[in-house]
């Protein structure tokens, strides 16, 4: 039960006090008691419940005609059952007794009022009056947890605006309101109560730039909503009529959880006594609601695809045809960024990551815009963000970044359980160097901090700085599977490729050519690849780098070897010993449900079929997956990327609610 104020009574004159329903009010009967009195009794109106405890240990007894010893160990508390119809209509009489004196009476006139700030603390999508049944001042995780949720209003419901909805002080329309969380103030008081009392709604100064609260005028259009709290206003005096009244507020978050903001926002209503104009207002009662800002959540390859993004660039029509066919098979919407908008930047995966935010009443896709800011810089803001599609970015917007800040270096695993710890939304994966040095690359700290602060997909740092481009999607992917954990981890594997090529040579296919049919590309015989000592050494190094990640992933995702599929792939070390795919990197694939768009490797053709394609199909088709090999050689591969790098996917949010997990 909420804590009320302390009321001191004195026999000299009647005391007038306010008691808020649902609160426990302490009654100080000792400090002003007549000197020679040794005991007391209490009588109260029917609407008042008095509890007397003589402790310790506290033995509680409701009032009757009993007398109690007058000593500091006696605790008297009041609660009220109903709101008052008029000021002071509930009475408490304390009678003091002494051995030689007649009883001395002290009178307390109580006004019972109902003041309650309600939000969806039960996470049902509806605001139900709680009236102190639950403590709204704490926010707890898990299926039995409680606490309200706020969305960052980061979409753009007004198509004529260039800004996010949370960047203005206005409510555009009912669409805009739906992105906000409802909070209701319920009051029931005597008619004249607010002539001597005031309600103030407030937020801590440290949180005022993270939230905006609009007050709605009931029965009027949403455009009548006016801002009452926000970055410029930490508090607001409310004009509340006496009697029974409900006031609606709409709350939007302005910031995502981050290193300097744990994501919790407390809104408080304070009841002030303003009856004495000579004195400052006194706090009579406070009620608070704690909201947690919904985290930005990534979706793994195992989630159903809903929309595919790719770029139109010079001469990639065939690539786009293949992606279009794949999207149609997977029943996905397709969005193509035209040449004039991408400014010859084809790396859609690197520019953005599409996740979502969720409250019980609303789910919103949100694009996380990377700070790489090349030709596609404007695409997430201008073409992705919009009505019911949010936007967030982090990191320096001008310089100070590395290739590891592109979002090909940002992936998420499917849900996993690791040594008994559940990650029902999976774990974020990003690449890093294995140790810091003058020239090592790492994901910008601002990005790392943001990802960690979301709390629900605890990040795992992998080692990717050994690659020229340096992205985790160059050596790993996840595909859905009907058995085991519901997915397989795919890892690029030079060892598997050498094994395959050796088998082919043993069967007399040493003369078969890699890169056959590619104009202007020097073809390589299987036997020459196998006999090239330098290439072997390079791939031995690469294998060690991937194996390091393999063990890390097994440990951090709780995987067994049988959860991993090795995809044959060779690499070559280039300048500064950085690795690049030797032939199109098959693990860098587009996963659309059971439909996979895999870079066509142009491997040695044996008995009319590419042996690399055949091997990959034999590994993936038993899982019910359909492999489509896409020619990306000249448009993507030679520019240091593949199919996954050149595409992006919006996926269906998890059915699991993030607030039901325990981070």
């Amino acid at each position: 039960m909420a804590q009320g104020t302390l009321i001191r009574v004195t026999p000299e004159q009647p005391t007038h006090a306010v008691c808020v329903l649902g609160t426990l009010t302490q009654l100080d009967i000792c400090s002003s008691a007549p000197e020679d009195c040794t005991s007391f009794s209490i009588n109260a109106s029917p609407g008042v419940v008095v509890d007397i405890a003589h402790g310790p240990p506290a033995k509680k007894k409701s009032t009757g005609s009993s007398t109690w010893p007058l000593d500091p160990g006696v605790e008297v508390t009041l609660t009220m059952k109903v709101a008052s119809g008029s000021t002071g209509d509930q009475k408490v009489q304390i009678s003091y007794y002494g051995p030689k004196t007649p009883p001395v009476k002290a009178l307390l006139y109580l006004t019972g009022v109902e003041i309650s700030l309600c939000a969806d603390i039960t996470r049902t999508g509806k605001v139900k009056p709680t009236r102190a049944v639950k403590d709204q001042r704490t926010w707890t995780w898990g299926p039995c947890g409680q606490g309200a949720i706020l969305l960052v209003n980061c979409d753009r419901d007004n198509l004529e605006s260039s800004a996010m909805d949370c960047e203005d002080d206005e409510v555009l329309d009912s669409e805009d309101l739906q992105d906000m969380s409802l909070m209701t103030l319920s009051t029931k008081t005597p008619k004249d109560f607010f002539t001597n009392h005031t309600l103030v709604l407030h937020v801590a100064r440290s949180e005022m730039d993270k939230v905006r609260v609009f007050q709605a005028t009931r029965g009027k259009l949403s455009s009548k909503c006016s801002v009452v709290l926000g970055p410029k206003w930490p508090s607001h005096y409310l004009m509340v009529p006496g009697g029974k009244h409900n006031m609606d507020f709409y709350v939007e978050a302005l910031a995502f959880p981050d290193t300097d903001f744990p994501g919790l926002i407390t809104l408080t209503i304070s009841l002030l006594d303003t009856s004495n104009l000579e004195l400052p207002e006194a706090v009579v009662f406070q009620d608070s609601v704690v909201f947690r800002v919904a985290p930005w959540i990534m979706t793994p390859n195992t989630q159903p695809p809903q929309e595919v993004y790719a770029c139109s660039i010079f001469e990639n029509e065939d690539f786009l045809k293949s992606v279009t066919t794949l999207a149609m098979k997977a029943k996905c919407k397709l969005t193509i960024c035209p040449e004039e908008e991408n400014m010859d930047d084809q790396w859609m995966q690197d520019e953005m990551e599409i996740g979502y935010i969720q409250a019980p009443h609303k789910t919103l896709p949100v694009v996380f815009d990377s700070p790489r800011n090349r030709g596609l810089k404007e695409f997430p803001i201008k073409r992705v963000m919009g009505p019911d599609f949010g936007y967030v970015t982090r990191g320096p917007q001008t310089g100070g970044i590395s290739g590891l800040d592109s979002f090909g270096n940002l992936e998420v695993s499917p849900p996993v359980t690791v040594r008994g710890k559940e990650y029902p939304l999976g774990r974020i994966l990003f690449g890093d160097s294995c140790y810091p040095s003058n020239d090592s690359r790492q994901m910008h700290q601002a990005l790392q901090d943001f990802l960690s602060a979301q709390q629900v997909q605890a990040p795992v740092k992998l080692y990717s700085d050994w690659l020229s481009v340096g992205h985790v999607d160059e050596f790993l992917s996840f595909v859905p599977a009907p058995d085991r954990k519901g997915f397989r981890l795919l890892l690029a594997s030079p060892r598997s490729c050498y094994k395959l090529f050796q088998e082919q040579q043993n069967e007399g296919h040493g003369e078969a050519l890699l890169f056959e049919g590619i104009k202007k590309k020097k073809q390589q015989k299987i036997k020459n690849i196998l006999s090239n000592k330098t290439l072997r050494e390079h791939n031995s190094f690469v294998e060690r780098c991937i194996d390091w990640n393999r063990e890390l992933l097994k440990r951090e995702l709780g995987l067994a070897e049988s959860d991993i599929i090795d995809i044959p792939q060779l690499f070559k070390l280039k300048e500064f010993s950085k690795a690049e795919a030797f032939f199109p990197n098959m693990v860098n694939m587009l996963v659309l449900g059971k439909h996979l768009g895999i870079p066509k490797p142009f491997g040695p053709v044996i008995n009319g079929r590419c042996c690399l394609e055949e091997k990959v199909c034999s590994l993936l088709e038993p899982l019910g997956l359909q492999c489509t090999f896409i020619n990306d050689f000249f448009t993507y591969h030679i520019r240091h990327g593949e199919v996954h790098c050149g595409t992006n996917v919006r996926r269906k949010p998890f059915s699991f609610k993030w607030w039901n997990m325990v981070p």
Partner: antibody, heavy 128, light 111 residues
Amino acid sequence: QVQLVESGGGLVKPGGSLRLSCAASGSTLSDYFVSWIRQAPGKGLEWVSFINSANTFTYYADSVRGRFTISRDNAKNSVYLQMNSLRAEDTAVYYCSSANDDVDDIVAPGRGYYMDVWGRGTLVTVSS
Amino acid sequence: QSALTQPRSVSGSPGQSVTISCTGTRPDVGRYNQVSWYQQHPGKAPKLIIYNVYERPSGVPDRFSGSKSGNTASLTISGLQAEDEADYYCSSHSRSSTPVLFGGGTKLTVL
């Protein structure tokens, strides 16, 4: 074969900044590794910085790390060297140089470590 | 002081051969085959004449040859000609924190 032209040099006070540009013609610079090399008056060559063709990693000499930033804009066919907190010892002719990354060998032979195309250089003088 | 050591000057008569040495350490010349040589005439930009220890770019006469033994690389110019008079610089990839090192340069005088 690509041709390179440097610009942006000039006289600057110690602590000041300059931005050098290296513009390419005759070929697409996105196919090339690019390095900046400098030569102080009457002295030898000193390697300064490198950026790979994919624009995914950079390297710097100890003497300039933290003060200089190399970047590229493949759409503009240019590479840049942003020089901050300049010192008198940074006075030199700055050369832009490149090596083609379009390698067909089974294993690339390390073209980022040598420079087969050079610009004519631009003089940077740091003096009060 | 340069990281790779070259003689300050060498000389030779037309038609003769000269060799310029470039001494490094195990983490640079000793470890890598990425040693290159540049020719620079006064007031001009350097020109690549040898890369990967011994390879010659197209257009460079075969009078120029490169080799390496241990931590020392060498440039040999046979059949010296007057136009060979120039400064010569060696360069190597290195495992040090500066990944490309140059020698201090050698002035070749054709007598």
